[in-house]
Each structure stands twice: as C-alpha cells, then as structure tokens.
Interface confidence: low
C-alpha cells in the first residue's frame, strides 16, 4: 500500500523567497504512479494544484498562475517536490501531496494524503533558537498510590512557528501511545504546548519518550524527551559526594540535554 | 462549476449516539461523480474514510456508513457509534475517476464539517486532583470528572504566569483537565477545583503516611544523561515531593 510522508510539518519563509516542500512516497514505486499536490488556504476549500504523472507529465489546475508552482519527482529518493516561487501572503496554506492507491480488493481505489506541510510567511526576525524547550513532569506519588497509574507531562515552550506534533512511545517500541494534549498557546512572540500520558502501574517501570516534531528542531530530527522509569520500591543510596542535603529535602535530578 | 456544500459547519455528537453528516452537490448531478469522505484530525492528518463503491479506509467499515441520495443530490456519512477518536473536520470530495471516456482524477472538496464529541449524559463524577511540579512550573492534573464545567485554581501568593486549562475527553468517556502555571513559590502551590458546587483540593489526595516507598528516577540513556547527582546516604525522599525534576536544554 502506498504511504506518503511530508517530513516538513511547516516551512517558514519571508516574502518573495522560494519554498520547497517535499513528499516521500513509500510502498509503491514513484515512477509507476502519479503524485498530486493540493492546498488548503485558511477558511477555503482544499484545492487541487498540480500533478506529476508516472511518465513525468505535469498537469496544472486551470487558473493557477504559470511559473508559480513547479512539481518534480526524484525516483532515486522516491520524492516529489513542490516548489513555490516568490512566496506571498496568499500562498499561506497547508500543502498536501496525494496519490491514488489500489486496495487489496479488486477495483477498489482510494486517494491517500500526506500529513501536510504548512507554509508560514513571516516578517519577524526571531531569536536564533526557536525550537521547543522541554520541561518534564513525573507522576505524583499520590496518583501512583491511589489510582495505580501515573501521568507524565511534557511541556514545550518558546517555539516558533506554532506547528508542532507530539506523540509518546515506550522505549524500544514503535507503538504510539494514547495521549492527550492542550491547545497550542501564544506567549509573547513564541508558543507553548503540553501533552500528557497516563500509564497503568505496570508500565511505570518502563522508560517513556515524548517525541516532538518541529521545523526548528536541531538538525531537523525529531526531539526525544526521555522520561525515566519510576519505581515504587525502597531506595538505598551509597555515599557519592559530600552532600549537605537534608533527608527531608527534595531529590532533585538535573537532566542535561547534551545534544542541544 | 460544481460545489459541494456541507449541511452544517459544526456538528456536536455524543459518544455512542449515531450521527449523520450530509453534503449536497450544487451545479451537477451527484450520480455523475464518485463521492469520497475524509477526516482531518489534530495535526492536519487527512484520513480516507469512504469512497462510493463500498470502499472504506482501514478501521472505518464497522463504525461508518457512506451513502448517496440521488433524489436529493446529496452524500451522507453516518457515524454509527461515535467515540472521542472521531473528533475532527469531515470533508466530502468528489471525483470522476473510472467513469469511462474523459475523466478527472483530481478531487473536488467541499468545506469541512467540524465534529465535536462530547461524553454521553451520565451520573456526575467528582474529580481526582493531583499536583506535579518542576522548578517554577506547576501542573494541576484533574482526572475523570463529569460534567465538564469546572474551575481550577492553583493557589499561590507568588504567581508568575498561568495558562488556560486544557479540558479533554478521557478514554473512559468522562473529562480530564490540566492547568499549568509558573510560580516563585512552587513548593507551596496547591490546587483547588470547583466542580458541581463542591470544592476538591489536591491536598485531599496526598499520601499522609511517612512511607519509604517512593519514585526513583533512573539514569536515562541516549544523549540525555543526568548530571552527577548528590545523594545523602540512606536518603528517604518525601513522597509528595518525588516528582520534582528539572530538565535543562
């Protein structure tokens, strides 16, 4: 079955620049299928823009200005690229790639869409680092005791643009866990968002990951925030350093993200 | 030019109660096109639900039913037993792929219908309230309550900032909520919740006994290594403070 991935969840440009949006096709040979590009402007219907067929023929929707959009495909990387020249305010939209895919049953064909790339146009000069800054919250002991479950919370702050995707996984598992999240909120010139995951007691001793996709993540890769396993057994600690912490004080574990 | 017009911009549905979305075609006979339905969820994911010819996307056949009313020139999508997963924007779209002769394989979309899901009417349930802290950040977690109306107060004399609460449907069909704030005195912050003319405090849920059970953060792997931790021998960590952990990037 064909699958489409649009690695950029957003693409931020200043006026008159060129935007290149990528769509990676898997499960089907790109040179044996047609790739379609659609756009959804805010408050408007989703509209077909342009397609490139298996034999390289390009078809543009009537009314689309010539020279504005360029579509291409690179069989070696199984990628189709939509290039938007001279970006202007009216190009602000979410752009989707799509293809017709045959189902297992005969004669059954559906059009599948990629997850979309939001084109953002800004005139702001932003700080050098507008990637999401994480803070983690571990379950309260009261919750683990009373409800035999624990909630992890992943807070992400000071990011731009507002487009962000968060999901959770257990370590060594690719299964996406059912989580909940708040709306993305504006704070001055940047945004914040949080997501939380409630797990049963039996999963509390597993490491969990809050995985964050954002345009400005370092090196363009998903950021993984590790939530350590938590145990409900007695801990005895050997002397490590000469510490003056009182036993009644909090145990503060400082995590440093050395990759940032 | 043809136009697909949804019957409603927003449709509120209750969990488990069947709902029907309608989309009429203007300017052409609907029988000349194939109708498709898609759902767009948070994060813009466009998922195929149904296409004429009895084609359903994976996982949709049991809970959705697509139909065409030729006489009324409209397409119908029934959600047989809505769940919180069905929240999103639903789009009808048409194509003429496979109709012989000159065909178009592009989709023409209508505007979306926003489907909001709310729990089924049920007995009132009092929430559980828990506080989670990290540095100046405090989160108040409010779990499993019904109905939705709620006021969450993070009690502090030294507020830096507070955010609007997130209220979502829980997997069990009630509500969960989280309110976040930043406070200079985060250690002393508590959470009080007004719900159903009653007040519930996070302190009501604190474990009162001096237990030696506690949550032990384990050293993490990958690139996120804890800095050298300083432990007192045989340290007993107070259970209500175990979730305090800061992460600096």
């Amino acid at each position: 079955a064909g699958h489409l991935e649009q690695p950029q969840i957003s693409s931020t440009k200043t006026l008159s620049k060129t935007a290149r949006l990528e769509c990676v096709v898997s499960g089907i040979t790109i040179s044996a299928t047609s790739v379609y590009w659609y756009r959804e402007r805010p408050g408007e219907v989703i509209q077909f823009l342009v397609s490139i067929s298996y034999d390289g023929t390009v078809r543009k929707e009537s009314g689309i200005p010539s020279g504005k959009f360029e579509v291409d495909r690179i069989p070696e990387t199984s990628t189709s690229t939509l290039t938007i020249h001279n970006v202007e305010k009216q190009d602000i939209a979410t752009y989707y790639c799509a293809l017709w895919e045959a189902q297992q049953e005969l004669g059954k064909k559906i059009k599948v869409f990629g997850p979309g790339t939001k084109l953002i146009i800004t005139d702001k000069q932003l700080d050098a680092d507008v990637s999401p800054k994480p803070t983690i919250f571990l379950p309260s002991i009261a919750e683990t005791k009373l409800q035999k479950a624990g909630t992890y919370l992943c807070l992400l702050e000071k990011f731009f643009p507002d487009v962000i995707k968060i999901h959770w996984q257990e370590k060594k598992s690719n299964t996406i866990l059912g989580s909940q999240e708040g709306n993305t909120m504006k704070t001055n010139d940047t945004y914040m968002k949080f997501s939380w995951l409630t797990v049963p007691e039996k999963s509390l001793d597993k490491e969990h990951r809050c995985i964050v996709r954002h345009e400005n993540n370092k090196n363009g890769v998903d950021q993984e925030i590790i939530f350590p396993p938590i145990k409900t057994d007695v801990i005895t600690m050997d002397p490590k350093d000469n510490c003056s912490k009182d036993a009644n004080d909090t145990l503060l574990l400082q995590l440093t993200n050395t990759s940032a | 030019a043809i136009e697909l017009v949804p019957e409603h911009q927003t449709v509120p549905v209750s969990i488990g109660v069947p709902a029907t979305l309608r989309c009429s075609m203007k300017g052409e006979a609907i029988g000349n096109y194939y109708i498709n339905w898609y759902r767009k969820t948070q994060g813009n994911t466009m998922t195929f639900i149904y296409r004429e010819k009895d084609i359903y996307g994976p996982g949709f056949k049991d809970n959705f039913q697509g139909d065409i009313d030729i006489a009324k020139n409209l397409a119908v999508l029934k959600i047989l037993a809505p769940s919180e997963r069905d929240e999103g924007s639903y789009y009808c779209a048409c194509d003429t792929l496979g109709m012989g002769g000159e065909y178009t394989d592009k989709l023409i979309f209508g505007k979306g219908t926003r489907v909001t899901v709310e729990p089924r009417s049920q007995p009132h349930t009092k929430p559980s309230v828990f506080v989670m802290k990290n540095g100046t950040n405090v989160a108040c977690l409010v779990k499993e309550f019904y109905p939705k109306d709620i006021r969450i107060n993070l009690v502090s004399s030294k507020k830096i900032t507070e955010f609007d609460p997130a209220i979502v449907i829980s997997p069990s069909g009630k509500y969960n909520a989280v309110k976040l704030g930043k406070y200079e005195d985060s250690n002393s912050v508590t959470c009080s919740v007004q719900h159903d003319n009653k007040t519930v405090h996070s302190t009501d849920f604190e474990v009162k006994t001096d237990s030696t059970d506690h949550v032990k953060p384990k050293e993490t792997e990958n690139t996120k290594q804890p800095s050298k931790s300083c432990h007192k021998p045989k340290a007993i960590v107070h259970t209500e403070k175990v979730n305090m952990m800061s992460l600096t990037v």
Epitope: A32, W100, E101, E105, L106, K109 | L97, G100, D105
Partner: antibody, heavy 122, light 111 residues
Framework: EVQLVQSGGGLVKPGGSLRLSCAAS????????MNWVRQAPGKGLEGVSS????????YYADSVKGRFTISRDNAKNSLYLQMNSLRAEDTAVYYC???????????????WGRGTLVTVSS | QSVLTQPPSVSAAPGQKVTISCSGS????????VSWYQQLPGTAPKLLIY???KRPSGIPDRFSGSKSGTSATLGITGLQTGDEADYYC????????????FGGGTKLTVL
C-alpha cells in the same frame, strides 16, 4: 481516435495454439485494466480473462484456466491472449475490452474492439 | 449456464417502456456494481449503464439502471426501432477467482 484494433484470429485444429493481439490507440493504455470477452455463435457474452494496468492481477474464467495466458506490453500499447490446447468449445468471436482507468478494474467495459473469430475445428 | 439470470426475450411497441431484469446472488450483484451492454446485430457490445445507474456520455436518458439487493434492472423508455438488440448485464463475482461474469442476454424486440 480512441480505439482497439484486434488481430490474430483464424482456423485452428483442436489441441492447437493461437495468439490474439489487441493494439490500443488514442488513450493512455498503461492506466487501464484490459479484458478478453468471447461470444460463441448464437450465444451470450463470456468473460475470458482480465489483467490489471501493471499486470499485478490476472484472472481467468474456469473454462480456460491453465490453457490461456493473458499478457500486456504497456510500452507497445498492446494486449495479448495466448491460447493453447484449443478445443471445439473455444470457437467464438473474441473481443478485447477496456476497463475503467484504475489500478485494478471497475467491472465495466467502456471500449471494445470489433472482435476476431477463432474457429477450432478438425 | 450463466452466473446471472436474464429473461431470454422481451418485447414492446415503439414509444412504450420496457424493463429487463438481471438476477444474481450476494457474491456478485449483491456486493458489486452492475453494468449493462447493448449489442446490435453483427457489432461489438456497447456500454449503456455502469455502476448500477450511471450513463456514459452519449447515452440518452431514455436508458436507466437500478439495483436492489441481488437484482438489477435496465429500463428503456420511449422505445425506438433502433433499440432492437441483445442486452447483457455484467458484474464481478467475488466468490469466483475468475473474470467478469455476464447474464445470458435478453433479446429486445420492438413490435
């Protein structure tokens, strides 16, 4: 002009072989599933074989399974039917027919060739 | 013997209306789409109706199709002498790993 031009019919002895060809023009052949349909003298239509656009799916009527082979060459815009071990009951007019423009098929034939007569007789 | 059952013949006077039935089972008509073909004497079949009720461009609206359960019907109104032909229904049968299946055909005579 959109059309299907057939060739290759004729008289053949029982047990013999014959290859039918169908040349497509005026449309993008590689987008369409293709079919062979036959009609015995004075009888109705019988689906013989179907092939999807990329040859991923191939189907035969039970009466010809193991004896007939359908194939296509998208570069040459051509459809073929190789008929081996022919029997008297295979005598019919053979039509090639175009299906809907999908990866598989839409269960209807919107373009037909004129047909070619295959006679199996000793 | 055909998988789909049609009456061998029907007849009506010019200007009249006629219907031709096509009966099958849940594995063919019941779960798939039906097409109808017209075959004038000495010619190849021609598509009249597809997907139960859709008409290709160029086919007059005198021809209509419908489906209910495991049966399909072709309707012809305002009969003309040029409509005298054999009519076939066709569909897919999901229980047979076979090609498309047809009805035995119905000879329409315009009196």
């Amino acid at each position: 002009e959109v059309q299907l031009v057939q060739s290759g019919g004729g008289l053949v002895k029982p047990g013999g072989s014959l290859r039918l060809s169908c040349a497509a023009s005026g449309f993008t052949f590689s987008r369409y599933s293709m079919n062979w349909v036959r009609q015995a003298p004075g009888k109705g239509l019988e689906g013989v074989s179907s092939i999807s656009s990329s040859s991923s799916y191939i189907y035969y009527a039970d009466s010809v399974k193991g004896r007939f082979t359908i194939s296509r060459d998208n570069a040459k815009n051509s459809l073929y039917l190789q008929m081996n071990s022919l029997r008297a009951e295979d005598t019919a007019v053979y039509y090639c027919a175009r299906d809907g423009p999908t990866v598989n098929w839409d269960y209807y034939f919107d373009l037909w060739g004129r047909g070619t007569l295959v006679t199996v007789s000793s | 013997q055909s998988v789909l059952t049609q009456p061998p013949s029907v007849s009506a006077a010019p200007g009249q209306k006629v219907t031709i039935s096509c009966s099958g089972s849940s594995s063919n008509i019941g779960n798939n789409y039906v097409s109808w073909y017209q075959q004038l004497p000495g010619t190849a079949p021609k598509l009249l109706i597809y997907d139960n009720n859709k008409r290709p461009s160029g086919i007059p609206d005198r021809f209509s199709g419908s489906k209910s359960g495991t049966s399909a019907t072709l309707g012809i109104t305002g009969l003309q002498t040029g409509d005298e032909a054999d009519y076939y229904c066709g569909t897919w049968d999901s229980s047979l790993s076979t090609s498309v299946v047809f009805g035995g055909g119905t000879k329409l005579t315009v009196l």
